[in-house]
Interface confidence: low
């Protein structure tokens, strides 16, 4: 109720002679701070004096503390909340009741705490789970109702007197609710731990034994079995007898049923501890064990591998891998059921024995086409030789072999011909499915492996084909060697290097870029007239009459090709000059007379000069000299001179006669 002081602390504290006691304690006074505190041992209230009698272990007043015996007792509290106490060391005669006499300014209170001090260290207490099963983790707990800051202790676990390797977790509690030290050990017991003694040992800080608690483990487990076989190696031949015996070495609780298993499957009507197998067959080879059950479950013995020996069975061949690519590696495996395993093998390729091959595996590092065929084998062990099985087929795949490009046309091939080529090969696996051609022209492929080139070009040089299955194999290119008429025929002037002047030495060359066949003939032609049959046409001294249009022809056995017409131009000074008169060389005075200077020149005359009978030059420089009106005095011989870039030429004299008109004659 509200008239009480409120205290919290453990009800009883436990310790032993020479140890210490730590008393966690809290309080709340009714009013104000604590002014006086006395710790009594077994206090008794004296009604006469209205005070408590008893041994005073500790006393403190507002005037100061009264020293206690060698400071054995310590008040670790304060004036309003904490009333924690420590007694160190604690003695056997400290057992009994401790009385905490508290006084504030107006209120008083006596709080009692029980102290149990034993003569010797008391033992801890081991707590076990209600049931322990093999291989299931359990927690073992060791509890001691003691803990004191001034007296360190340790709890150690032992199994059959030997410290346990598993790590234990130790915890302590020094609270107003409880005071204890606890050690917890996580442990997975095996069936072999059944009946074993577990100890929790209390030790001081130096590891000195103080006390202990022990328990015996009751580990529930399935039956533990041993199997014995006759003959002991469990190796027999067909027709022999075998006996197997099952012995129970441990079971908790007791076993209830027995059975036998072969390769994990229960054998019918075999429920005794002995299994008798008479006249065994190879099918009875396998792994045997006995199974015994109790309430925990079934226990199994180790397996006995019974080997019933027999001669090899007909063999089969496994190939890694077929089809195989030429050049790759292949492994053959001979598979034959036998016991003991075969020690020797005989291999056959297409029915013929393969010499030197006696292993289970045959490895061919580099497969070739001839390795294809049927592979079979025979296995042999100490009991006999097996039969040859059906064998396995090896398919060797390889690119097409010996591929050739063949020209089907009669030779030679001429430009413009239709050329047919075929792509041939010697062998192929898998079969050839397509062909490739180089270069890749947009050509016709009328059938598989045939190429048709219409209107073959003169520059089609080489063609190669490939036959393809999973791979393409290329033939060496074949030259078409297309024959054609000479190409790009043209006339080229070799000399002179500059323009041709009359009288020069001139050479013309007939050029062409190519011809197949190379043997050619030349023809030079001017205005339909054959001039020569050499590659050059030579003029020792060219004349204006040689000017004109020239062509050269080049021909071979395929055909002939003409050049474009080439014009030869000869430059010469004015020649064949003459003076012509119009209307004639006799003209009546008063009329008009025109003198023309006619010439032949290349380039044409650029400048004319006129002369009279006295070789006097006249002031006229055009081709025509016009006299109008003509006078009798104009009568006489005239000549002209023509000039071009090459030189000059002059005409002979031409005489003009001017006669009198009838009027003049009449006047005379």
């Amino acid at each position: 109720d509200s008239s009480k002081w409120v205290f919290e602390h453990p009800e009883t504290l436990y310790a032993w002679e020479g140890a210490c006691v730590w008393i966690p304690c809290t309080y709340r006074a009714l009013d104000g701070d604590l002014e006086s505190f006395i710790l009594f041992h077994n206090p008794e209230y004296n009604k006469n004096t209205s005070k408590f009698d008893g041994t005073r272990l500790y006393e403190s007043t507002k005037d100061g503390k009264v020293p206690s015996e060698q400071k054995r007792v310590q008040f670790l509290g304060d004036k309003n909340k904490n009333c924690t106490l420590s007694i160190h060391p604690v003695h056997l005669n400290d057992s009994g009741q401790l009385g905490l006499r508290m006084e504030s300014k107006t209120e008083k209170w006596m709080e009692r705490i029980h102290l149990n001090v034993s003569e010797r260290p008391f033992p801890p207490h081991i707590q076990l789970p209600p049931e322990i099963q093999e291989s299931q983790e359990v927690t073992l707990t060791c509890l001691l109702n003691f803990s004191c800051y001034g007296y360190p202790i340790q709890l150690q676990w032992l199994l059959e007197g030997v410290p346990m390797r598993q790590a234990a977790v130790t915890s302590t509690s020094l609270t107003i609710k409880s005071v204890f030290t606890r050690s917890e050990l996580k442990f997975s017991p095996q069936w072999s731990h059944h009946g074993k003694i577990v100890t929790c040992q209390l030790q001081d800080a130096d590891g000195k034994f103080l006390s202990n608690d022990t328990v015996q483990l009751n580990v529930k487990h399935t039956p533990k079995l041993e199997i014995k076989v006759t003959p002991s190696d469990a190796i027999v031949r067909e027709g022999d007898s075998v006996t197997m015996t099952c012995e129970v070495s441990s079971s908790n609780p007791e076993y209830t049923t027995v059975s036998w298993l072969k390769d994990g499957t229960s054998l019918k009507k075999q429920n005794t501890f002995t299994l008798n197998l008479r006249e065994v067959t190879k099918d009875q080879s396998g792994k045997y064990c006995c199974q015994v059950s109790n309430d925990v479950g079934p226990g199994r013995s180790e397996e006995v591998f019974l080997q019933v020996q027999y001669a090899p069975e007909p063999s089969t061949v496994q190939i890694l891998h077929s089809p195989a690519v030429e050049g790759s590696q292949v492994e053959f495996l001979c598979m034959s059921l036998a016991n003991p395993l075969p020690t020797n093998y005989t291999w056959y390729h297409n029915g013929k024995e393969m010499q030197g091959r006696t292993e289970e595996k045959v490895h061919i590092p580099k497969i070739l086409p001839w390795h294809a065929g049927t592979y079979s084998c025979v296995a042999e062990n100490i009991l006999g030789t097996g039969q040859r099985g059906p064998g396995a087929e090896l398919d060797v795949q390889y690119p097409p072999k010996k591929v050739t490009t063949v020209i089907q046309n009669p030779m030679p091939i001429r430009e413009g011909d239709t050329v047919t080529l075929s792509c041939n090969y010697n062998s192929s696996n898998p079969s050839v499915t397509r062909y490739e051609w180089k270069p890749h022209g947009a050509w016709e492929e009328p059938s598989l492996g045939v190429l048709k080139i219409q209107n073959v070009g003169w520059d089609n040089t080489t063609i190669a084909c490939a036959a393809c299955n999973s791979w393409c194999s290329w033939a060496s290119p074949v030259a078409l060697n297309v024959q054609y008429a000479p190409r790009d025929v043209r006339v080229r002037k070799i000399k002179p290097l500059s323009e041709i002047h009359s009288g020069n030495s001139v050479s013309l060359q007939c050029d062409f870029s190519s011809s197949h066949p190379k043997e050619v003939q030349f023809f030079w032609e001017k205005n339909g007239r054959l001039l020569g049959k050499e590659s050059q046409l030579n003029f020792d001294s060219i004349s204006p009459e040689d000017a004109g249009s020239y062509s050269c022809w080049v021909n071979n056995s395929i055909g002939q090709t003409a050049s474009k017409a080439w014009t030869l131009e000869v430059l010469y000074a004015p020649r064949r000059l003459r003076v012509s008169m119009s209307p004639g060389d006799q003209v009546m005075e008063g009329k008009s007379a025109t003198l023309t200077c006619e010439s032949d020149a290349n380039p044409p005359v650029s400048h004319y000069t006129w002369f009279d009978w006295n070789n006097q030059s006249l002031p006229y420089h055009s081709q025509k000299l016009r006299l109008e009106p003509v006078k009798v005095q104009h009568s006489g011989a005239y000549w002209c001179q023509g000039t071009n870039s090459v030189g000059k030429g002059r005409s002979p004299l031409s005489t003009l006669t001017v006669y009198y008109s009838p009027e003049t004659i009449g006047r005379r």
Epitope: P399, R434, E436, K438, P439, H440, G441, A442, T461, T462, A464, A466, W471, C472, S473, W474, A475, S476, P477
Partner: antibody, heavy 116, light 108 residues
Framework: QVQLVQSGAEVKKPGASVKVSCKAS????????ITWVRQAPGQCLEWMGW????????IYAQKLQGRVTMTTDTSTSTAYMELRSLRSDDTAVYYC?????????WGQGTLVTVSS | EIVLTQSPATLSVSPGERATLSCRAS??????LAWYQQKPGQAPRLLIY???TRATGIPARFSGSGSGTEFTLTISSLQSEDFAVYYC??????????FGCGTKVEIK
């Protein structure tokens, strides 16, 4: 003159796909095949495959079978190479090549980087 | 597949000197072998096809020889522009067309 112009550089994440184009000009596109070759940084040249622009026939390197597809579009004279399920070791310069026995013309190359 | 082995892996040569590169095939490839040149950051360039035929525009200092399983690329007088990696390639049996792993020709 003959020219092969390839698409630009690409950066891809592992597991993605890339499609490189190669536009041809200056010759009759269907008269030649297109070969694709790649070169990883500082490594050898690796032949990837070939396509006939004439009939679309393809031949692929066995190593890339199932991951690579080569196609052509004759209307635009363009060849394409698609590579799927990219891995970091597919990082390389990819070239297209006009295929002929006597001469060949290469594209400028396309750098494909595969990085997470 | 046909394996091509190139030797040496690296060849140190002075400009103007002759360089001889070797390529060995694991089985006969007839004369269906090509040689390529590759410079850093560039696509390979065809030098020789059919083991010995120069491709269009390839200088006469490059020559190829051999047939069957042994092949040689010879550069008669090395020019500065010839320092590169050289690969051989077979197209005899395919798929796959296979390449050698290259010979690096470097300046001595």
């Amino acid at each position: 003159q003959v020219q092969l112009v390839q698409s630009g550089a690409e950066v891809k994440k592992p597991g993605a796909s890339v499609k490189v184009s190669c536009k041809a000009s200056g010759y009759s596109f269907t008269s030649y095949g297109i070969t694709w070759v790649r070169q990883a940084p500082g490594q050898c040249l690796e032949w990837m495959g070939w396509i006939s622009a004439y009939n679309g026939n393809t031949i692929y390197a066995q190593k890339l079978q199932g991951r690579v597809t080569m196609t052509t579009d004759t209307s635009t004279s363009t060849a394409y190479m698609e590579l799927r399920s990219l891995r970091s070791d597919d990082t390389a310069v990819y070239y297209c090549v006009r295929d002929s026995n006597h001469e060949d013309f290469w594209g400028q190359g396309t750098l494909v980087t595969v990085s997470s | 597949e046909i394996v091509l082995t190139q030797s040496p892996a690296t060849l140190s040569v002075s400009p103007g000197e002759r360089a001889t590169l070797s390529c060995r095939a694991s089985q006969s490839v007839s004369s269906n072998l090509a040689w390529y040149q590759q410079k850093p950051g560039q696509a390979p360039r065809l030098l020789i096809y059919g083991a010995s035929t120069r491709a269009t525009g390839i200088p006469a200092r490059f020559s190829g020889s051999g047939s069957g399983t042994e092949f040689t690329l010879t550069i008669s007088s090395l020019q500065s522009e010839d320092f590169a990696v050289y690969y051989c390639q077979q197209y005899h049996t395919w798929p796959p067309v296979t390449f050698g792993c290259g010979t690096k020709v470097e300046i001595k």
